[in-house]
């Protein structure tokens, strides 16, 4: 029998320092570009190798960005969100939502040597 797929949603504050080529990621979403059904939020679609975000390591593709330097990203046009990042300054604080997929299988006996974590 297959297990149910659930999601564990966590929030995190990520402080990035703008690198020589910027923050180093792409975004999708906005009120005029809904990437997720019934959600006009802003999502990370790509993290550039060796960019500031990649070197920091916490921001992940698929993360939802809730705010930038305390400014809410709700109900923004796509380009307005892009411009907000571009004008965010050298030190950029991101409030992000991670959505981790959790496989809930049938409960079974944990055998010897199985991870107990």
């Amino acid at each position: 029998m297959n297990g149910r797929v659930d999601y564990l949603v966590t929030e995190e504050e990520i402080n990035l320092t703008r690198g020589p080529s910027g923050l180093g990621f792409n975004i999708v979403g906005g009120t005029d570009q809904q990437y997720v059904s019934n959600d006009s939020g802003i999502y990370v679609s790509r993290i550039k190798e060796n960019g500031a975000a990649a070197l920091d390591g916490r921001l992940q593709e698929g993360d939802k960005i809730l705010s930038v330097n305390g400014q809410d990203l709700k109900n923004l046009l796509h380009q307005d969100a892009v411009d907000l990042f571009r004008n965010a300054g050298y030190a950029v604080s991101l409030r992000v939502q991670h959505r981790l997929q959790v496989q809930n299988g049938p409960i079974g006996h944990r055998g010897e040597g199985d991870p107990s974590g």
């Epitope: 910027g22 990621f25 792409n26 999708v28 990437y35 790509r46 550039k48 190798e49 892009v82 571009r86």
Partner: nanobody, 127 residues
Framework: QVQLVESGGGLVQAGGSLRLSCAAS????????MGWFRQAPGKEREFVAA??????LYSDSVKGRFTISRDNAKNTVYLQMNSLKPEDTAVYYC??????????????????????WGQGTQVTVSS
Amino acid sequence: QVQLVESGGGLVQAGGSLRLSCAASGRTFSTYTMGWFRQAPGKEREFVAAVTWSETLYSDSVKGRFTISRDNAKNTVYLQMNSLKPEDTAVYYCAAVQGSPVDTIVVLTTSEEYDYWGQGTQVTVSS
């Protein structure tokens, strides 16, 4: 995974026009940034033009002569090339990456910014 197929290349006389097309697979085409690059024999691949959700960018060598546009309903990006010159002769490649860069749009001039590439279409401009 996105697949890109270019078409529209050919042989044209200097001063003439061509329109290149790049058809993309995928349901979320509108969220992709699309670019055109070209590579002449013995030269490096060079940036030509790019279009995001709401911005366009051109290399200085084609500005005023070439126009990039997209039709999200048809999953296609176009490169209208006017006033062609012999130095425009090259293989033209379509490229794609999901999303818009949060950094200056100028980052789109580098090929490392793109994840998907077409096979290319040959454009030859004779004098």
